[in-house]
């Protein structure tokens, strides 16, 4: 599949219209700036609750705040999936659920949120300071992961407020999809601003060619794009302060009893809002990862509807192992 963004060639201003054109070049940057700032960065929220009835029984709820379609959700504990975490459940929006002890029941709550009940007894039972992570693979945004745990002083029956996840992970599909167009717009904006700085009334030259967005190849990213997008995996434990009730979701995220609407009615929060995002609760993680699509498995892809691309660099089997399989 190829995604090409055709940008119309800019025509030179007609004589006598330089004043109006100056106005236009001032308006365009602001339009682009607004686009850049409000361009949705998806978010993942995580909520961990200890059941009052069974002190060692937990309920984890996770949700995805983005406009893309979710292709897979992985819930892990002990850290992010693939970084020391062990998979508790994998949920596919069409194909169902795979879960592992101490998971008792994983289920979809809405099209963009899931819940997982953990067993309260046995050797593999969670303890109060266990970190639980939720990773949402979506198209076109890529994979987004957030982690959370119960605050140390939690009373049974209380839940930690939803942990916001201003996560900076974007996969190839996201980068070369919607983001590609926005990136082009932002670069173009900077270019315009720079030119505007040097020349108060710039005379735009006719564009001979139509620039194209990079061509996205889901299965085999080019070496160039791999090099350009390579960011080492990092997990930052933001144990800055204990979770308090002011660690609310930036969108006034769902309370424990409130169900998310089937479709998020708001646009995801943009990069500009990161600065105002509350620090995640104690024991929460923010993961920074650039994963590129890799061919999943050695076998030729099966044909037929419902085929899902797994935007995890380690392929779909990574979902089932502690450090990822293969």
């Amino acid at each position: 599949m190829r995604t090409e963004a055709q940008v119309p060639a800019l025509q030179p201003p007609e004589p006598g219209l330089e004043g109006a054109m100056g106005h236009r070049t001032l308006v365009l940057p602001w339009v682009l700036l607004t686009l850049c700032v409000t361009a949705g960065t998806p978010e993942v929220w995580v909520q961990v609750r200890m059941e009052a009835t069974e002190l060692s029984s937990f309920t984890i709820r996770c949700g995805f705040l983005g406009s893309g379609s979710i292709s897979l959700v992985t819930v892990s504990w002990g850290g992010p999936n693939g970084a020391g975490g062990t998979t508790l459940a994998v949920l596919h929006p069409e194909r169902g659920i795979r879960q592992w002890a101490p998971a008792r029941q994983a289920r979809w709550e809405t099209q963009s949120s899931i819940s997982l009940i953990l067993e309260g007894s046995g050797a593999s039972s969670p303890c109060a300071n266990t970190t639980f992570c939720c990773k949402f693979a979506s198209f076109p945004e890529g994979s987004w992961e957030a982690c959370g745990s119960l605050p140390p002083s939690s009373d049974p029956g209380l839940s930690a407020p939803p942990t916001p996840a201003p996560i900076l992970r974007a996969d190839l599909a996201g980068i070369l999809g919607v983001s590609g167009v926005l990136l082009f717009g932002c670069v173009y904006l900077l270019h315009l601003l720079r030119r505007h700085k040097h020349r108060p009334a710039p005379r735009l030259q006719p564009s001979r060619t139509s620039p194209q967005a990079p061509r996205a190849r889901a299965w085999a990213p080019s070496q160039a794009s791999q090099a350009a997008l390579h960011v080492p995996y990092a997990t930052i434990n933001t144990s800055c302060r204990p979770a308090t009730l002011d660690t609310a979701h930036p969108h006034g995220g769902p309370s424990w009893w409130a169900s998310l609407p089937t479709h998020a009615a708001h646009r995801p929060q943009g990069p500009a809002a990161w600065a105002s995002t509350p620090i995640p609760a104690r024991g929460s993680f923010v993961s920074v990862e650039n994963g590129l699509y890799a061919q999943a498995g050695e076998r030729p892809p099966h044909t037929g509807p419902g085929l899902t691309l797994f935007p995890d660099p380690r392929g779909p089997r990574a979902m089932e192992g502690p450090l990822g399989v293969r």
């Epitope: 062990t86 998979t87 994998v90 596919h92 929006p93 069409e94 194909r95 169902g96 659920i97 795979r98 879960q99 592992w100 002890a101 029941q105 994983a106 289920r107 999943a296 498995g297 076998r299 099966h302 037929g304 509807p305 419902g306 779909p316 089997r317 979902m319 089932e320 192992g321 502690p322 399989v325 293969r326």
Partner: antibody, heavy 119, light 107 residues
Framework: EVQLQQSGPELVKPGSSMKISCKAS????????MDWVKQSHGKSLEWIGA????????SYNQKFKDKATLTVDRSSSTAYMELRSLTSEDSAVYYC????????????WATGTTVTVSS | DIVMTQSQKFMSTSVGDRVSITCKAS??????VDWYQQKPGQSPKALIY???NRHTGVPDRFTGSGSGTDFTLTISNVQSEDLADYFC?????????FGGGTKLEIK
């Protein structure tokens, strides 16, 4: 060729325990989880549970939680199912089946182990 | 638990005919349904996964359809070797559950 080879038929006494083995070959054992299925004589199939050979993580049908224990031996690429406190109700054919986590289904089944519980 | 109901326990057909085996889920299971064939004295074998995708090597006379609660396995141009039990399976929720099976008999 991908193969799952199960241990032979068993005749066991009520109240006893037994262990069925399922040896995998022709693929990387830790890449696929292994599920177990029961088929009582002339009846349908019942899913017992699954094990992830990578880390030994298990998942059980609550109905079989006190009946079956799933384990793996990675060194020999073998999955095991132990059945305890056997009764005549446990007389059945037990299958191990490989779960394809790319496409979400049981793509390879073993030949099955017939267990007869009788005094 | 999700109940998978295969209402026809037995179905009789002739070689060359077209037959449809149905499976109904007690709740919405999206497309998390597979079909397995079990010939007499053998272990089950995968036919269809995710409601409509054929397993490798399965003849194209086998087709799966449906989503939500109603699923169908259709065998067109039935062959004598298709004599078998056919089971549906849901893996939308735990525990995974199979249908009661439909035995296909060849006249």
């Amino acid at each position: 060729e991908v193969q799952l080879q199960q241990s032979g038929p068993e005749l066991v006494k009520p109240g006893s325990s037994m262990k069925i083995s399922c040896k995998a070959s022709g693929y990387t054992f830790t890449d696929y989880s292994m599920d177990w299925v029961k088929q009582s004589h002339g009846k349908s199939l019942e899913w017992i549970g699954a094990i992830n050979p990578n880390n030994g993580g298990t998942s059980y049908n609550q109905k079989f939680k006190d009946k079956a224990t799933l384990t793996v031996d990675r060194s020999s690429s073998t999955a095991y199912m132990e059945l305890r406190s056997l009764t005549s109700e446990d007389s059945a054919v037990y299958y191990c089946a490989r779960w394809d986590s790319d496409y979400w289904y049981f793509d390879v089944w073993a030949t099955g182990t017939t267990v007869t519980v009788s005094s | 638990d999700i109940v998978m109901t295969q209402s026809q326990k037995f179905m009789s057909t002739s070689v060359g005919d077209r037959v449809s085996i149905t499976c109904k889920a007690s709740q919405n299971v999206r497309t998390a349904v597979d079909w397995y064939q079990q010939k007499p004295g053998q272990s089950p074998k995968a036919l269809i996964y995710s409601a409509s995708n054929r397993h490798t090597g399965v003849p194209d006379r086998f087709t799966g359809s449906g989503s939500g609660t109603d699923f169908t396995l259709t065998i067109s141009n039935v062959q004598s070797e298709d004599l078998a039990d056919y089971f549906c399976l849901q893996h939308w929720n735990y525990p995974y559950t199979f249908g009661g099976g439909t035995k296909l008999e060849i006249k």
